[in-house]
């Protein structure tokens, strides 16, 4: 008789999840020699230990502490790029601007990027059928708690000028409910962070509006200012040209506004 299994509203664990996490860990240490001290088997064991045999609606940041400890990494605190709802462009940017880092350029972010995972209470099985949805089921699920934990730590580490890339094509350019709006903004340390600089990325070719005047950006400015951090905002009218100019800053067309 098949055992009754909890049906959640979200997609199940990504196929080949254990293999993918382990492979990503080894790949990361291969391309980042400064992280060669990391024991990837221990990293996987700590990752697994955070959610296996636990109720997938009852995960805490504490569950991820062994993993956080193993994945401790120093990134230049003044070279942090946050993003909201525009991940691909942020990653294209750090691929070119090698001295800047998104969360997914760190070991822990790289391990979990685009993956879903959850277990079941009292069994060592990984649930490949379904996992809790943040809205429909519960917020304290393994994936959400992981990203909340690593995002908080990443924001806490930031210093000097912190950049954030925002999607100007969204109805809410700044969304208080995004990870950036609900976690990262509130964990920037005013004693370390001088300025948050927002880059609002335009979607339309002919869009020449000043999206820095958008009400949600004003809301972000207000939140940041209340935290004694300065705020600045730039429109990126042509993201394609922006990337090209990061690659070739000496190009003559790169002096005009992008």
């Amino acid at each position: 008789v098949p055992r009754w299994r909890q049906q959640w509203s979200g997609p199940g664990t990504t196929k080949r999840f254990p293999e993918t996490v382990l492979a990503r860990c080894v790949k990361y240490t291969e391309i980042h020699p400064e992280m060669r001290h990391v024991d990837c088997q221990s990293v996987w064991d700590a990752f697994k230990g955070a959610f296996i045999s636990k109720h997938p609606c009852n995960i805490t940041e504490e569950d991820y502490q062994p993993l956080m400890k193993l994945g401790t990494q120093t990134v230049p605190c003044n070279k942090i790029l946050l993003w909201s709802r525009i991940k691909d462009l942020a990653h294209q940017f750090t691929q070119v601007q090698r001295d800047m880092f998104t969360l997914e350029d760190t070991l822990l972010g790289y391990l979990a990027d685009d993956l879903t995972w959850c277990g079941e209470f009292n069994t060592s099985k990984i649930n490949y059928q379904s996992c809790p949805d943040w809205r429909k089921d519960c917020s304290n699920n393994p994936v959400s708690v992981f990203w909340k934990t690593v995002s908080r730590r990443f924001a806490e580490a930031a210093c000097d000028v912190v950049h954030v890339m925002l999607n100007g094509s969204r109805s809410k350019i700044f969304d208080k409910n995004s990870t950036f709006g609900s976690v990262e903004v509130h964990n920037l340390q005013p004693e370390k962070v001088q300025t948050l600089e927002a880059w609002v990325i335009h979607g339309g070719r002919e869009d020449s509006r000043d999206l820095c005047q958008d009400p949600t950006i004003k809301e972000l400015e207000s939140i940041i200012s209340k935290r004694n951090i300065q705020f600045s905002c730039k429109n990126i009218y042509r993201p394609d040209k922006f990337l090209q100019c990061v690659k070739n800053p000496e190009d003559s067309s790169c002096t005009s506004e992008i």
Epitope: R16, E19, A23, R24, K27, I31, P33, R36, H91, Q95
Partner: antibody
């Protein structure tokens, strides 16, 4: 079994470009970094760069930075190395290679090599 | 870039001999070193990784030692199949770099 199969030999004119392919089989393509190494006739091996096939992220040796582009097609489990502005010194055997994850970061697996001849 | 210097560049030896090839790194590479064997017209073959670990399927007459900046590859008793060119490679830092090679020929 694990195999890296490269495209055939190429003869190119000075100033042109060449694109060499490396088709992977027998393993999950996205699980391993792919490297490119070249060897001019009678010379030592020279590392050119790597690609993470999962994300397409790359890194190149400074020497090749302006002329090399490594790409991949995940659906075809194939990596590509394109070298532009060819000169006679680029005449070499070009190899794709990867580690085994169990053998440190030495290259345990190699393609058979693609001979690129650059003539004026 | 880290320079890898191999010596000798050519080595003449006979079947049954014990031979040693040396590789020196221009800076500390810990144990992040590999040794390869290459025969004419063929791709290199990994022999040793992490300075002293034998790769799968490699005969036990091959051994590696050293750490830091000085490394050696030893073949305890040369076999006819061992006449080839040998390369060391550091993978401590990018760009990965190779030694210039040691050609092992029959005396």
């Amino acid at each position: 079994q694990m195999q890296l199969v490269q495209s055939g030999a190429e003869v190119k004119k000075t100033g042109s470009s060449v694109k060499v392919s490396c088709k992977a089989s027998g393993y999950t393509f996205t699980d391993y970094i792919m490297h490119w190494v070249r060897q001019a006739p009678g010379q030592a091996l020279e590392w050119m760069g790597w690609i993470d096939p999962e994300y397409g992220r790359t890194d190149y040796a400074q020497k090749f930075q302006d002329r090399v582009t490594i790409t991949r097609d995940r659906s075809m489990s194939t990596a590509y190395m394109e070298l532009s502005s060819l000169r006679s010194e680029d005449t070499a055997m070009y190899y794709c290679a990867r580690s085994a994850h169990t053998t440190g970061f030495g290259f345990a697996y190699w393609g058979q090599g693609t001979l690129v001849t650059v003539s004026s | 870039d880290i320079q890898m210097t191999q010596s000798p560049s050519t080595l003449s030896a006979s079947v049954g001999d014990r031979v040693t090839i040396t590789c020196r790194a221009s800076e500390d590479i810990y144990s992040n070193l590999a040794w390869y064997q290459q025969k004419p017209g063929k791709a290199p073959k990994l022999l040793i990784y992490d300075a002293n670990s034998l790769a799968d399927g490699v005969p036990s007459r091959f051994s590696g030692s050293g750490s830091g900046t000085e490394f050696t590859l030893t073949i305890s008793s040369l076999q006819p199949d061992d006449f080839a060119t040998y390369y060391c490679q550091q993978y401590n830092n990018y760009p990965y770099t190779f030694g210039q090679g040691t050609k092992l020929e029959i005396k």
